[in-house]
Each structure stands twice: as structure tokens, then as C-alpha cells.
């Protein structure tokens, strides 16, 4: 199988003529040590061609879990889910650019993208790199946890003397602590508002607004549709 | 539908290992999110949770038993396997598996369960 | 680990009463809160999932309400088949716990 025909990611699959977004099945490559996996695509969203890698908008899988469950992903792929660092670090190999959509709970969708976005190995402790922003989300809210180790509430990483994911109740790129926490409480209308510890993007609706909705997608940056 | 039935020993000893089987139909656990947990209730009391293992392999335990326990999952057989180490007669209770859907850790179908008896 | 505490252990009720069962979190679980009801000999039986989501096939005088620490399952009127016992579990982070119980009895 040559390195053209063979399928890595959503985009490949893009190539290859499957437009519908959907559940799928990536094969496993020896090569490159990757075990069969099963991703949602995005084939339409801005030329499609994009691997869904979290989900938040049910709000009834927990997001408050381990080292290990971060690491091998959990939650439901057609539901909220996390793929797993070890599949979004494989992903993100190639060059490759960051989606973030959210949607508040007046029904506004907004969207951050990142030139460049590279997950470091677990030795590296999943470290985030990014590159430019880009998108209508407000301020850049995942700048301040740009070149930041990942932090779960048995793997404290941060660079704070508080544990951040205990503080905020979830798996990410800890700082000191949040200027966004994309993995944090899903809270229903009502408490939405309340919280410090929800799924925050300071850059639009500040600190304590727990988002209704989100989706991190990823794609090559080379992708043409 | 979804079934799952307990099965091993009604009666073990002191010291011995406990090895409870899960056989499940009407799901797959390779299914993403899919997971089956192990629950027990001794006569009388609560209920405890055990374990839980999900369709990726993830395992999950109860830390105050974690030393005790270990999980499997034979996904063709569409079985999974509980075994507990050095049963003390305070483990006498009734055992049960249960079906962690996709959507959330609880638990919507479960077993009929198996009472253990641990006595010499 | 996160402590579930039910209220009352146990309640004497008379059928057409309305019920209310409690249930505190040692810290906030937000809706991550299940209820499951038990029959003598029988296994659980999930009622209402996600702090107020009704299970499929469970009868609508069942609700649940609540979110952050405090839950509360109720029963609209109740039923003779509703003598049981309830347990409230949550699922925010393992280890998943449950609750001690509440023996709803015949008055």
C-alpha cells in the first residue's frame, strides 16, 4: 500500500470520494503503529475533510476522568466523546490545523482555527504547540495554554501550585489555569452561568459561561477539497 | 434485546479466588462508548460497585478493592470475566454485571445476578 | 471518592401519596446523578438517569430534579409496585457510588 492510498484520517477518506460526515473506520497501519480506530468526519464544515476529536453537546458523559481514559479516549463517538491523546498525538503528526466550534446557549455559533496544532508524545506529557488564530470566538482563549503539558486529576502538570484539574474538573492544557477548559463540567441552562469550572472560552463569554456546545476537529493543513 | 446473565461458584472459601463469568447478548462491546460494570450488594445492604470495562479495553476499578480485582473482556464470546483474589466471608453477597450504554456511566439493563457465599 | 447520602433510610407511604427522596453529593457532581429502584430478590432497575432524564418504559409519575449537590426523586402517586427501594449513584467520576438506599414501605 503506497503512502497515497492509504488511509490516515478523515481527509484521506475526503480523497478517496466519501463526502458524507459520518462514523468511520480507519484502518489499522503497521506502519506507523496505528490500530484500527473509528472516527467521526466532518465532509462538510469549510471543505470537510475534518476528524472529529471532541464532542461536548449532550452533556451526559463525564469529562472528569484519568490519565489512562485521556490517553485511550472514552465516551461515544456518535455522542460526547474524547478520540484519546494518543490517537489525536498519531493525527496530528503531519502538519496539521485545529478547529474549535461552540455554540452558547442563545443558539450563537462561533469558531477559533489554528494554523498549525502539533500534540506531543506521552513522554512529552501530550504537550500542546499552535499556531495562528484565526476565526470569531473573541479573543484567542487557547494562546495562554499554547506550549502547556496535559494536566488529568491523577497527573498534575500544570504550571500552578493549585491542581488545576481538580480545580476545573477536567483533562486539558492546565496553565495556572484557564483561559479555556473545552473539557470542563457540562452544565444545563439555568446553571450555565454560575460555574468556574464548566466549558469556558474566556475570549467570548468570560470566565464563568459553560458553553452548550463544542466540537474539536483537526485536518492537514496541506487539505485541499 | 439486551440480556446478561452471572455465572461461577454459589460457594467458595476463605482465601480462595472468585471468578464470575458475564454472558451478554443484544450488544457489542466493541461498540464505541459500550461498557459492562460489575456490581455487589451483600444481604441485607447497599450496593457497591466493582469494576467497569469499556469497549476500548479501559478498566476502571473500585480503589478500596482494586488490589483484589481484575477485569476482562472476550469481545467474540461476547463475555466478560470478573475475578476476585482471597475472598473473605465480609465478600458474601450477591453479584451482578451490568450494561454501561454509550451515552453514560450508569447502568440500564442488568443481570439477575449470583449469590456467592464465602464460608469454609 | 465522592459520598452519596440518601434520605430518609426508610419512609411509610400510602398509595396515591406523593414521595420525595433525597439525595446529597460530598461535593458537586452537576447532573452526573442516577436513580434505580429495587424490588426484594430482584436486580436494579434504572429510573432516571442523568439527574432528570427518564429511563424508556418507566412510568411518567417518576421524576428526579436537582443538580450541584442536592437531588430529589419524586413520585407523583404513588403505586402499589412502587414499594421498594431506591438508590440514588453518581457518575462524574469514578469510583461510581451509590447511595444507601430508602425503603419505601406500605403505611
Known amino acids: 500500500q503506497t503512502s497515497a492510498d492509504a488511509i490516515y484520517d478523515c481527509s484521506s477518506l475526503y480523497q478517496k470520494n466519501y463526502r458524507i460526515s459520518g462514523v468511520y473506520r480507519l484502518p489499522s497501519n503497521d506502519f506507523l503503529g496505528s490500530p484500527e480506530l473509528e472516527v467521526f468526519c466532518d465532509m462538510e464544515t469549510k471543505g470537510g475533510g475534518w476528524t472529529v476529536i471532541q464532542r461536548r453537546k449532550s452533556g451526559l458523559v463525564s469529562f472528569y476522568r484519568d490519565w489512562k481514559q485521556y490517553k485511550q479516549g472514552f465516551g461515544s463517538i456518535r455522542g460526547d466523546f474524547w478520540l484519546g491523546n494518543e490517537h489525536i498525538h498519531r493525527l496530528s503528526r503531519q502538519p496539521t490545523r485545529l478547529r474549535v466550534e461552540m455554540e452558547d446557549w442563545e443558539g450563537t455559533v462561533r469558531y477559533a482555527e489554528y494554523s498549525h496544532f502539533v500534540l506531543s508524545n506521552e513522554l512529552n506529557s501530550y504537550r500542546l504547540f499552535l499556531g495562528n488564530y484565526s476565526g470569531n470566538a473573541g479573543n484567542d482563549a487557547l494562546y495562554y495554554h499554547n506550549n502547556t503539558a496535559f494536566s488529568t486529576k491523577d497527573k498534575d502538570n500544570d504550571n500552578c501550585l493549585d491542581k488545576c484539574a481538580q480545580l476545573r474538573k477536567g483533562g486539558y492544557w492546565y496553565n495556572c489555569c484557564t483561559d479555556s477548559n473545552l473539557n470542563g463540567v457540562y452544565y444545563r441552562l439555568g446553571e450555565h452561568d454560575k460555574h468556574l469550572d464548566g466549558i469556558t472560552w474566556y475570549g467570548w463569554h468570560g470566565a464563568n459561561y459553560s458553553l452548550k456546545r463544542v466540537e474539536m476537529k483537526i485536518r492537514p493543513e496541506d487539505f485541499k477539497p | 434485546q439486551i440480556t446478561l446473565k452471572e455465572s461461577g461458584p454459589t460457594l467458595v472459601k476463605p482465601t480462595q479466588t472468585l471468578t464470575l463469568t458475564c454472558t451478554f447478548s443484544?450488544?457489542?462491546?466493541?461498540?464505541?462508548?459500550?461498557?459492562v460494570g460489575w456490581i455487589r450488594q451483600p444481604p441485607g445492604k447497599a450496593l457497591e460497585w466493582l469494576a467497569l470495562?469499556?469497549?476500548?479495553?479501559?478498566?476502571q476499578y473500585s480503589p478500596s478493592l482494586k488490589s483484589r480485582l481484575t477485569i476482562t473482556k472476550d469481545t467474540s464470546k461476547n463475555q466478560v470475566v470478573l475475578t476476585m483474589t482471597n475472598m473473605d466471608p465480609m465478600d458474601t453477597a450477591t453479584y451482578y454485571c451490568?450494561?454501561?450504554?454509550?451515552?453514560?456511566?450508569?447502568?440500564?439493563?442488568w443481570g439477575q445476578g449470583t449469590l456467592v457465599t464465602v464460608s469454609s | 471518592d465522592i459520598q452519596m447520602t440518601q434520605s430518609p433510610s426508610s419512609l411509610s407511604a400510602s398509595v396515591g401519596d406523593r414521595v420525595t427522596i433525597t439525595c446529597r453529593a460530598s461535593?458537586?457532581?452537576?447532573?452526573?446523578l442516577n436513580w434505580y429502584q429495587q424490588k426484594p430478590g430482584k436486580a436494579p432497575k434504572l429510573l432516571i438517569y442523568?439527574?432528570?432524564s427518564l429511563q424508556s418504559g418507566v412510568p411518567s409519575r417518576f421524576s428526579g430534579s436537582g443538580s450541584g449537590t442536592d437531588f430529589i426523586l419524586t413520585i407523583s402517586s404513588l403505586q402499589p409496585e412502587d414499594f421498594a427501594t431506591y438508590y440514588c449513584?453518581?457518575?462524574?467520576?469514578?469510583?461510581?457510588?451509590f447511595g444507601g438506599g430508602t425503603k419505601l414501605e406500605i403505611k
Open positions: 451490568a450494561h454501561n450504554p454509550d451515552y453514560g456511566d450508569f447502568f440500564d439493563y
Open positions: 443484544g450488544f457489542s462491546l466493541s461498540t464505541s462508548g459500550v461498557g
Open positions: 470495562i469499556y469497549w476500548n479495553d479501559d478498566k
Open positions: 461535593q458537586s457532581i452537576s447532573s452526573y
Open positions: 442523568a439527574a432528570s
Open positions: 449513584q453518581q457518575s462524574f467520576s469514578t469510583p461510581l457510588t
